[in-house]
Interface confidence: low
């Protein structure tokens, strides 16, 4: 949000006399720096210093003691903190020309003579004059090439492959550049970048491998950013595949991984000839050792109805891949002897899902089931109890005379899961017992009648009712009921 720095002189361009000195002042609201045409080796006569002044602004002065043709170019003043490698410098610019009658063109590095163009794209042949007034023509093997010229940049146009020469005349003297070689490369307007990490979870000591592939482009700069980058821990490789189409495969390998190598692995591909950029990222985690986590989707006590089909699903997170087995009452589940099946499927890289399936639940399926997951570093288990719910049924209803005392006990045995409740009813008028309204529930607190209940095992219960004295014929009904059903029998 800082306003752009200001430059004095406040001009877009300035012509400076050969061998004279010149200075450029930059004012900014934060610390400012200069970017200028020459490389650091060539810039011995360029001095940059900070200047104290009474403006409250940061002032940086660029001074050239003896201007030469090589000083011709764009000078940019920018805020230090805004400079990033990717984007063009955002700042204030001034273009300086230093006309030299003996140097018509600004000296260039050898790489500048290689001009890379993409299929039918425009390009710049960077022959820049030291004097803005110098007329320039562009030639190739066929003669003069029509192209627009800007002394700050060079010739701009659509050029066919081959050598090009810039020609200028200064005070009757002819100057020619060495040939600029225009070279065409395969490139697309969008970068097709794919990242592949066969694994994203590792443990200490393993080798991390990540690849990025760029399709249909020859002019690509690819940078890796990853946690171990500062230590230079990774090994990068490039493989160029030409058939059936161009594919550049960049591989990053990080051997002997540690927990510190966990984090984001990013590849950023950039086209060398245009501002097209694409990036892909994957998060890699490195664990000190292998691990297992078990997450059941049900509780530790589960019920199933008789003959029901039911699935019990357990989510497992593990690395390295686990072996998963099921036990029933601490014995390995032998699936072919029961109507119980288990399976394991891989959901994601380190996520697995195991299912225990009851096809038609039977009473004998009740018990303790355990899932065990293990790998070379860890073992985890989860146990739950399964109850097969059986509707209540009466097994037996008998009476027992007490001889001379005239007392009588009726015993009712019932089974079911959950254990049935037993209720007693009596009908005192035998002739009317077909009518439900003639039956009354036997209350516990009636004198001369005692009711008791005893469970014989987990699924069998026995109820008793004792009549101290039976003076007339009565009918007795035993009602056994649980969540799944009720049954009654009469005596």
């Amino acid at each position: 949000q800082l306003s752009l720095p200001s430059i004095l002189p406040n001009e877009n361009e300035k012509v400076v006399q050969l061998n004279s000195s010149f200075s450029l002042r930059c004012f900014g609201e934060s610390e400012v720096s200069w970017q200028y045409p020459m490389s650091e080796e060539e810039s011995s006569d360029v001095e940059i210093r900070n200047e104290e002044n009474n403006s409250g602004l940061f002032v940086t002065v660029l001074e050239v003691s003896s201007a030469s043709a090589a000083h011709t170019g764009l000078y940019t003043c920018y805020y230090n903190h805004t400079q990033t490698e990717e984007n063009e410098l955002e700042g204030r610019h001034i273009y300086i020309y230093v006309p030299d009658p003996d140097v018509a063109f600004v000296p260039l590095g050898m790489t500048d003579y290689l001009v890379i163009v993409e299929d039918d794209d425009s390009a710049i042949i960077p022959c820049r004059t030291t004097d803005p007034e110098t007329p320039v023509t562009l030639h190739n093997s066929e003669g003069v090439v029509p192209a627009s010229y800007d002394s700050r940049q060079g010739f701009n146009g659509t050029f066919t492959v081959g050598p090009y020469i810039c020609e200028a005349t200064v005070k009757g003297k002819k100057f020619q550049t060495i040939p600029f070689n225009v070279y065409a490369l395969k490139a697309t307007s969008e970068l097709d970048l794919e990242m592949e990490a066969l694994k994203t979870v590792y443990k200490s000591g393993e080798t991390i491998v990540v690849t990025c592939a760029v399709f249909n482009n020859e002019v690509v700069d690819l940078q890796w950013t990853y946690p171990g980058e500062v230590k230079g821990k990774g090994i990068t490789m490039l493989e160029e595949i030409k058939v059936p189409s161009i594919k550049l495969v960049y591989t990053l390998t990080v051997p002997e991984a540690t927990v510190k190598d966990s984090g984001d692995y990013e590849c950023a591909a950039r086209q060398a000839t245009r501002e097209v950029k694409e990036m892909k990222k994957v998060t890699i985690s490195v664990h000190e050792k292998g691990f297992i986590e078990i997450k059941p989707t049900f509780s530790q006590l589960e019920a199933v109805n008789l003959h029901e089909v039911k699935h019990f699903v357990v989510e497992v997170r593990a690395y390295p891949p686990p072996r998963i087995s099921w036990l029933k009452n601490n014995l390995t589940l032998i699936e072919n002897l029961t109507e119980i099946t288990t399976d394991v499927e891989k959901i994601q890289e380190i996520r697995y899902r195991s299912k225990l399936k009851l096809i038609r639940a039977k009473e004998e399926d009740s018990g303790h089931y355990t899932i065990v997951a293990q790998n070379e570093d860890a073992v985890k288990s989860y146990t739950f109890e399964l109850l097969t719910q059986v509707p209540s049924s009466i097994l037996d209803l008998v009476d027992d005379h007490h001889g001379s005392t005239g007392g009588q006990t009726v015993r009712c045995t019932a089974e079911g899961t959950p254990l049935p409740d037993i209720e007693w009813m009596i009908c005192k008028d035998i002739k009317k017992c077909n009518n439900e309204t003639s039956w009354t529930i036997l209350a516990n607190n009636v004198s001369n009648i005692i009711t008791e209940i005893h469970s014989r095992d987990r699924s069998t219960v026995e109820g008793r009712v004792t009549f101290a004295k039976v003076e007339e014929t009565i009918a007795v009904r035993c009602l056994a009921k649980n969540l799944l059903g009720a049954e009654n029998r009469e005596l």
């Epitope: 609201e29 403006s55 409250g56 602004l57």
Partner: antibody
């Protein structure tokens, strides 16, 4: 020596208009952002707005945007503040300043809004 | 708008004491903060800019620190002439805003 001199203040009726000027000297006026700041009697400082060197960007404090207009004339080295629809709460000492922050402020011109 | 809060309207101190004035921004303003001194009947006088840079000619007993949302202005040894109102200002984003001011009184 850098100098900023405000003028144009005075007594104005509620709903009226007034144009303040700030004459700059001693520096290259054409490369600096310029600001207006005001201070009501006995109160703190309130930033009014700023204008960039070529007048292509002008920023105002939102509550004053519809009643104040900042402009400049680089040829005359002068900054302006056109005030309209003034109210009693616009009574203040009006300062012009070089940049968004900085050491160079004028001495201020007093605007009094009263019936 | 970014609100700059100076928690103390008044601070009382003695000559030779160390005094710190705080300013809190309602959101991150990086280091785009200036501190001004204003004496009665005068225009504000810049002391610190960019949070910690002392302006030319300002005595080194005045210092500034902080970044983000919390800023501190310190006078290491108060002098009688330091009696004034001190303002912080953010110039990170428009509208630029000032703190309410802290009046330094000498006992």
């Amino acid at each position: 020596e850098v100098k900023l001199l405000e003028s144009g203040g005075g007594l104005v009726q509620p709903g009226g208009s007034l144009k303040l000027s700030c004459a700059a000297s001693g520096f290259d006026f054409s490369i600096f952002w310029m600001s207006w700041v005001r201070q009501a009697p006995g109160k703190g400082l309130e930033w009014i707005g700023e204008i960039n060197p070529d007048s292509s960007t002008i920023n105002y404090t939102p509550s004053l945007k519809d009643k104040f207009i900042i402009s400049r004339d680089n040829a005359k080295n002068t900054l302006y503040l056109q005030m309209s629809k003034v109210r009693s709460e616009d009574t203040a000492l009006y300062f012009c300043a070089r940049q968004r922050f900085g050491p160079y402020w004028g001495q201020g011109t007093l605007v009094t809004v009263s019936a | 708008d970014i609100v700059m809060t100076q928690s103390h309207k008044f601070m009382s101190t003695s000559v030779g004491d160390r005094v710190s004035i705080t300013c809190k921004a309602s959101q991150d303003v990086s280091t785009a903060v200036a501190w001004y001194q204003q004496k009665p009947g005068q225009s504000p006088n810049l002391l610190i800019y960019s949070a910690s840079y002392r302006y030319t000619g300002v005595p080194d007993r005045f210092t500034g620190s902080g970044s983000g949302t919390d800023f501190t202005f310190t006078i290491s040894s108060v002098q009688a002439e330091d009696l004034a109102v001190y303002y912080c200002q953010q110039y990170y984003s428009t509208p630029y805003t000032f703190g309410g001011g802290t009046k330094l009184e000498i006992k």
